[in-house]
């Protein structure tokens, strides 16, 4: 199976014990990790950060131990822009520059692979995106003639069903890339109003349309349905919770909210915590599981957090076995405990090694 | 065909509210972000509000943050605009918009509008 | 944010040809997508070009549109000028959830 790990430059501006270089990472661990993101300016892909190419050194430099190990560069991500994508992919000019620019980059800074992190395209775009992913696979051939090993070609998907439908043809962007990362988190967000978890395993009791489509068994299936192959797909899991302000005396799963929750003392983003973070906010919480939905979530106060633990990764990949997936997809290896100082386990990165376990299990 | 109606405009005091509604029909109003836009007298247009095609996301111009409210029903194809703590210069015509995409995050742009209804904020 | 830029009016004669700029304050102009709107008195603004140069079905095409990395602007072309052209023109554009406007071109068709 297929263990594929994203990293984050922004990771390393968290502060002290929040701030995570490539070098921090275990080699051993994943079978792909995928560094996020890249730029593309002027056509080309590009760096983001000033030191991308020196992290950029370090995140492949864990090849030299572990030469299994294959390492991708991501392109795109929220702050990029989906018109900035649009632009570049529907003008022939703007996409063939592109395209011929990322070989070479690749090949320089020692990536085996491009992902693609177009969120996400529109209406407009989606004989676009398809047309960029066709046309990026044929270079990636081309370029391999001389008897080099071909560059790997994946894409990170939304995994709502709107947005599938809108934004993929599912069926052609399956036959040119290597494997497809679907995004099965964020389904719940502080705008319904009440809790909820963002990475359920499967549809709640009290689910109703729309929300019977915001689950991980029903991303995949549609998925699988539209043409996607099992032996491509690889199911997202995520190494942070979504968080909630309470709003009244109500704590479970529906409860009124007044909007997300109070920031991470590292990430600082108000409805988001890593993993790292939650283990500090289990200390003395309260922690309950969504039994059809197989995850957790966690109150203290006014605070409610839906996360993941060993326990929810387990039965995620269980799942994603007993569907003939690829593998998982972790987001992120920086929002796991990667120092191991958090959780209280001595083990670093506890989620990630716990999908890899599952995984590895017979 | 797709039709944009606004209705609820008329002569408001200052510091008082008013609502907006855009009556949608020919087309599946579910399926669309929808906007508000004015033009006030004499002056040109001005992007106010936006929300997507279940309401999940919004957006608003820093001149109305924190004193007007954009949603939509779904079942009633209807999309609103209250608007509270009403200024002089909030007079406009409001037009409700159609955007070409379902999400904010792809910036479609305006392919259908209504006729406007007119809003003046006056003592 | 940033800002869009137009000509306060522009006037030409029917069968000419007439160009109204439109620039972008911050921002790369070819980052994202330009519109322009046609809004006569009393109508509801009709889109006459999207995506920088799409012609919506029913718009003649005596109406093109085109950016210009090297001047941040976009233009709205109109050939032929005819009498029913005369309206008022904004170019609109988006940025990091903002839709914004130029402050409008009035386009008067002489004679």
């Known amino acids: 199976y297929k263990l594929v790990c994203y990293y984050t430059s922004w990771s390393q501006y968290r502060e002290g014990d929040g701030s995570c270089f490539p070098d921090a990472l275990d080699r051993f661990l994943c079978t792909h990790i995928i560094y996020s993101f890249a730029n593309i300016s002027n056509d080309h892909i590009d760096t983001w950060e000033w030191n991308d190419v020196t992290l950029y050194g370090m995140l492949n430099t864990l090849k030299n131990r572990n030469p299994n190990l294959k390492t991708l560069l991501s392109v795109g991500g929220w702050n990029f822009g989906s018109q900035r994508f649009s632009k570049i992919a529907s003008n022939t000019q703007s996409r063939r520059t592109f395209i011929k620019s990322v070989p070479p980059f690749l090949r320089t800074h020692g990536f085996d692979g491009l992902d693609l992190a177009w969120l996400y395209p529109g209406r407009r775009d989606k004989q676009h995106f398809t047309t960029l992913i066709k046309e990026m696979k044929a270079e990636f051939i081309k370029e391999a003639q001389p008897g080099k090993k071909q560059l790997l070609l994946s894409a990170a998907l939304s995994a709502g069903k709107v947005t599938i439908d809108s934004s993929y043809d599912i069926a052609k962007i399956s036959q040119h890339l290597d494997f497809i990362s679907i995004m099965t988190y964020d389904f719940h967000g502080a705008w319904r109003g009440t809790t909820g978890h963002h990475s359920p395993l499967f549809r709640g009791q009290e689910d109703a349309s729309p929300d019977r489509f915001s689950n991980t068994d029903y991303a995949v299936g549609y998925m699988l349905r539209l043409g996607a192959p099992a032996s491509k797909l690889v199911m997202g899991i995520p190494t942070f919770g979504r968080s909630f302000t309470l709003a009244s005396s109500e704590t479970g799963v529906g409860a009124p909210i007044s909007g997300p929750g109070i920031p991470g003392r590292f990430t600082k983003e108000a409805g988001t915590l890593a993993y790292y973070e939650i283990c500090d906010f289990l200390r003395g919480a309260t922690v309950h599981r969504i039994l059809g939905q197989q995850v957790p979530y966690a109150t203290k106060g006014n605070q409610w957090v839906g996360y993941d633990d060993q326990e929810s990764v387990k039965s995620k990949v269980q799942y994603l076995k007993d569907r003939q997936l690829a593998g998982a997809m972790v987001w992120a290896l920086d929002l796991d405990d990667f120092q191991g100082s958090f959780c209280g386990q001595d083990l670093r990165f506890p989620l990630t090694n716990a999908i890899k376990d599952a995984l590895a299990a017979t | 065909q797709v039709q944009l109606v606004e209705s609820g405009g008329g002569v408001v005091q200052p510091g008082r509210s008013l609502r907006l509604s855009c009556a949608a029909s020919?087309?599946?109003?579910?399926?669309?972000?929808m906007h508000w836009v004015r033009q006030a007298p004499g002056k040109g247009l001005e992007w106010v509000a936006v929300i997507s095609y279940d309401g999940s996301n919004k957006y608003y111009a820093d001149s109305v943050k924190g004193r007007f409210t954009i949603s939509r029903d779904n079942s009633k194809n209807t999309l609103y605009l209250q608007m509270n703590s009403l200024r002089a210069e909030d007079t406009a015509v409001y037009y409700c918009a159609r955007d070409t995409e379902l999400q904010l995050w792809s910036g479609g742009y305006f392919d259908y509008w209504g006729q406007g209804t007119l809003v003046t904020v006056s003592s | 944010n940033f800002m869009l830029t137009q000509p306060h009016s522009v006037s030409e004669s029917p069968g000419k040809t007439v160009i109204i700029s439109c620039t972008r304050s911050?921002?790369?102009?070819?980052?994202?997508?330009v519109q322009w709107y046609q809004l006569r008195p009393g109508s509801a603004p009709t889109t006459v070009i999207s995506d920088d140069d799409q012609r919506p079905s029913g718009v003649p095409d005596r109406f093109s549109g085109s950016i210009d990395s090297s001047s941040n602007s976009a233009s709205l072309t109109i050939s032929g000028l005819r009498t029913e052209d005369e309206a008022d023109y904004y170019c609109q554009s988006f940025d990091d959830s903002n839709w914004v406007f130029g402050g409008g071109t009035r386009l008067t068709v002489l004679g």
């Open positions: 020919g087309f599946t109003f579910s399926s669309y972000a």
């Open positions: 911050s921002g790369s102009i070819a980052h994202n997508y």
